[in-house]
Interface confidence: low
């Protein structure tokens, strides 16, 4: 079937359009191009004769058609008049007539749009604003962008005037944004230019910053206002109700107690003709003065003064904090507060009680400290000791001791020997030193300040001999796999070889086994039985030699499994059951027996005479070491039976 | 008395990050905005960005929103910024300002650090 | 962003002379223009804040004027420690900006 096709179908004005035809019968004569739906001489257009290849124009002709050999028609340079149908008209060589008509619609290239507004400074929650879009096209439509986005659905947003208007209801600042329209045709689209609404809004309550209404006498008052207008707005500062100056900041330096009072902020927008204030209510503290301490004892004596420091000076209605070593009071009975904590009072002071302390006065705003104040506790002086710890010196030699005693002040030292005031000095120094230098050697310390003295004795022997040694332990029953023992060589002489025998034998060599302090201190660690020995000590120099009386170490173990002998535990009714238990155990364990969990006696030896099949059942011993805090338990199954029965055994 | 001091020079190359920091003394820390400002040598000043230390919000110029970034540590006083993705123009002097007043009125400045990009 | 345009770019000018230096903002910016200082050395000092407001410590022969889009700093009467480079800059919008500078030099 014969079909025209309008290439395109929507013409822009100015362009061309092509009538593609479709289906042209064979054997043609010719053909006629008419402008509308029929055959009309009257709008012929052109007709083409195919024998003689020539085209002919009609009334209708405008100049801008090209008729092809194939009757496609093209027209070009479209004007808005050229919208409508086209019909073909076609003359076959048997002049039979077939006709067709296509059509297709022209539109106008559009303008590049622009928005109008009724309202360029619309109001917050006051004023509507109409944007337009210009210029109002025929066969157009409308489209409205916010933000590069479509339009939100809202109900203070209103389309109108065929889209072509846009209405927003009661302006809000969100709606400052940027506004653009869209015009649309099947042949263009345009886009205008964005428009931001500025929206006139504010002030809004404003803010005063900072926060803080408290300040000492003597700060800076710095206050800032601020409230979201637009525009901006114009701030103006009252205090107490009187008008201070037109800014955005209050600043007033080193104010008083004076300046307490109400502030007022208040927010002109000139555009909107709206004011609003906000009040905070400052308050300006006097400053306290700096707070310091008093002692009525600079120089307390240990264990016998007591001391009451105060926090100056006395403020009514004041609260006042103490600090000892920078951290708060401790709990102690010998620390006591006054009633208005003003005083602290340390009972009997200690060397330990030295400080710092410190005290605070607390206000509205802070806590004020004093500096910090040290006690001097007069104390010793303690016990002297005497170094180093030699008692034994051979002939020839040089004999330095030196004495010290815990004291403040320092204490002052006197040397006496066998009771005779030798030198008051803290070291003695005798060169050379011979038989007849051996004696009582007495250290004396003395504090001036609290009129104190202390003393040690120390024996000091001179001999080319060397005297018998001994053993001391620092402890005399040990634990097995439990505790360490360390065996020291007593005494401890200058230039002194020290040695150690085990049962008669050189030390073995074990890990268990360290020697210390010159060799003269054996440690054995995780002592066992197995070191329950004989130990000796020997000393030598160069001179003579000798040792010790040998040392036992009684090692407490145990108690280990205990056995139940005889081991049978089958019997015939009738014979006599005689079990005895063992547990190696030093010291000897405690032994008690159960018979099916009942306890019987606290024996080593359980004696049943004539037994009888009632006593089957299980029996159990235990053993007990009160020493070694350790217990330990066996339970036997015991069967009798009936005479004859079984190859029992009688006892 | 009011004092801002910056950490010291610092020499980056293109591609890599630096961080200034700015330690303030002398008034209550938490209570003024801290800016950031900088000048390219020979150059006027560009406010890159501020912080309130209070609360950790901040305000950036969007010429340099996605490369600098602004941090605080209140127990040390002390405001960060942290400059990405350096280029040779972002050779400058990089102040730390305090806005004392409000609306940007910058009362206080610290002694500039100089940060120089150089392949 | 807000232009701001400062003028002149430098002046030489001696002790004692009355200096005026301008800043002319793209946009009304209310009275949030502030004026800075920064000698040689890079230390920058505010002077003015705004428009007209003395910095507590800044010397009275400074002043500051203007409305709208049009502001002034003045110097009285230029004294040798007056020699730097002077900014102006608005606070009124986000995000802030400075203008070009006006160095003061010595004549």
């Known amino acids: 079937k014969l079909t025209i096709e309008s290439t395109p179908f929507n013409v822009a004005e100015g362009k061309e359009v092509l009538l593609l035809v479709h289906n042209l019968p064979q054997h043609l004569f010719g053909y006629s191009w008419y402008k509308g739906e029929r055959v009309d001489g009257n709008r012929q257009i052109i007709g083409y004769v195919i024998g003689t290849q020539q085209a002919t124009p009609g009334p209708a002709y405008s100049g801008r058609e090209i008729i092809y050999p194939n009757a496609s028609l093209l027209i070009q340079n479209i004007i808005q008049n050229d919208t409508g149908f086209y019909t073909l008209h076609v003359i076959k060589s048997d002049l039979v007539n077939e006709e067709a008509t296509g059509q297709f619609r022209v539109y106008p290239e559009l303008p590049k749009p622009s928005i109008s507004s009724n309202n360029s400074k619309p109001v917050e929650d006051k004023d509507a604003v109409a944007f337009t879009c210009e210029p109002e096209t025929q066969d157009a439509t409308y489209l409205w962008w916010v933000n590069n986005q479509s339009l939100p659905v809202s109900p203070r947003l209103q389309l109108s005037n065929g889209n072509r208007t846009l209405t927003l209801f009661n302006v809000t600042r969100n709606d400052t944004a940027s506004y653009k329209c869209e015009t649309q045709n099947p042949v263009s689209a345009r886009r205008s230019d964005s428009v931001i609404l500025n929206v006139l809004y504010g002030p809004d309550a404003p803010t005063i910053s900072p926060l803080n209404t408290s300040y000492r006498s003597g700060e800076n008052l710095n206050l800032s206002c601020h409230a979201a207008s637009n525009p901006p707005a114009q701030y103006s500062w009252f205090v107490n109700g009187t008008f201070q100056q037109s800014t955005q900041e209050l600043f007033i330096p080193n104010i008083t107690v004076n300046n307490s009072g109400s502030y007022t902020c208040q927010a002109h927008n000139s555009d909107t003709g709206l004011n609003r204030t906000t009040v905070t209510t400052i308050t300006v503290y006097a400053e306290p003065p700096k707070p310091f301490i008093t002692s009525n004892n600079s120089n307390p004596v240990e264990d016998e003064d007591a001391v009451a420091l105060t926090c100056e000076p006395e403020i009514q209605n004041t609260t006042y904090l103490w600090w000892v070593n920078n951290q708060s009071l401790p709990v102690s009975p010998r620390l006591q507060l006054s009633n208005d904590n003003r005083t602290l009072t340390l009972l009997s002071v200690t060397r330990n009680d030295v400080g710092p302390y410190e005290c605070g006065i607390q206000n509205e705003l802070s806590v004020d400290h004093s500096d910090p104040v040290i006690l001097n506790v007069l104390y010793g002086p303690d016990d002297p000791t005497i170094s180093p710890s030699y008692t034994y010196y051979r002939p020839g030699v040089n004999l330095s001791l030196s004495c010290h005693a815990a004291s403040n002040p320092p204490a002052q030292y006197s040397w006496l020997i066998d009771g005779n005031i030798q030198q008051h000095t803290q070291e003695l120094f005798i060169s050379n030193i011979t038989e007849k230098n051996s004696g009582l050697y007495t250290c004396q310390a003395n504090n001036s300040a609290s009129g104190h003295s202390r003393t040690t004795v120390k024996t000091i022997t001179v001999s080319a001999e060397l005297p018998k040694p001994s053993i001391s332990s620092n402890n005399s029953k040990p634990v097995e796999d439990k505790d360490a023992v360390a065996f020291t060589c007593e005494p401890e002489a200058q230039n002194t070889t020290y040695l150690w025998w085990v049962n008669g034998q050189s030390l073995p060599v074990s890990p268990r086994l360290q020697l210390s302090n010159g060799n003269r201190t054996l440690t054995l660690f995780n002592v066992t039985r197995n070191d329950a020995r004989a130990y000796v000590c020997g000393i030598q120099n160069s001179v003579s030699a000798n040792r010790s009386d040998p040392v036992t170490l009684d090692v407490l173990y145990g108690p280990d499994t205990p056995i139940i002998s005889p081991p049978d535990s089958s019997y015939l009714s009738g014979a006599n059951l005689n079990l005895s238990c063992h547990s190696a155990s030093n010291p000897s364990p405690q032994y008690s027996w159960r018979i099916n969990g009942i306890p019987q006696q606290h024996t080593q030896v359980l004696f049943i005479a004539k037994i009888t099949p009632n006593n089957n059942g299980t029996y159990a011993c235990f053993v007990s070491n009160l020493a070694t805090g350790r217990n330990n338990s066996i339970v036997k199954s015991i069967t009798v039976s009936a005479s004859g029965t079984s190859p029992g055994l009688s006892a | 008395e009011v004092q801002l001091v910056q950490s010291g020079a610092e020499v980056k190359k293109p591609g890599a990050s630096v961080k200034v920091s700015c330690k303030a003394s002398?008034?209550?820390?938490?209570?003024?905005?801290m800016n950031w400002v900088r000048q390219a040598p020979g150059q006027g000043l560009e406010w890159i960005g501020d912080i309130f230390p209070k609360n950790g919000n901040t305000d950036y110029n969007r010429k340099f929103k996605d490369r600098a970034t602004l941090t605080v540590d209140k127990s040390t006083s002390t405001v960060y910024m942290e400059f990405s993705s350096l280029r040779s123009e972002d050779t400058a002097v990089y102040y730390c300002?305090?806005?004392?007043?409000?609306?940007?009125?910058?009362?206080?400045w610290g002694q500039g650090t100089l940060v120089t990009v150089s392949s | 962003d807000v232009q701001m345009t400062q003028s002149p770019s430098s002046l030489s000018a001696s002790v004692g002379d009355r200096v005026t230096i301008t800043c002319r903002t793209s946009q009304d910016i209310n009275i949030y223009l502030n004026w800075y200082q920064q000698k040689p050395g890079g230390a920058v000092k505010l002077l003015i804040y705004?428009?007209?407001g003395l910095l507590s410590g800044v010397p009275s022969r400074f002043s500051g004027s203007g409305s709208g889009t049009d502001y002034t700093l003045t110097i009285s009467s230029l004294q040798p420690e007056d020699f730097a480079t002077y900014y102006c800059?608005?606070?009124?919008?986000?995000?802030?900006?400075f203008g070009g500078g006006t160095k003061v030099e010595i004549k």
């Open positions: 800059q608005q606070g009124n919008t986000l995000p802030p900006t």
């Open positions: 300002a305090r806005s004392g007043y409000g609306n940007y009125v910058f009362d206080y």
């Open positions: 705004y428009r007209s």
């Open positions: 002398g008034y209550t820390f938490t209570d003024f905005y």
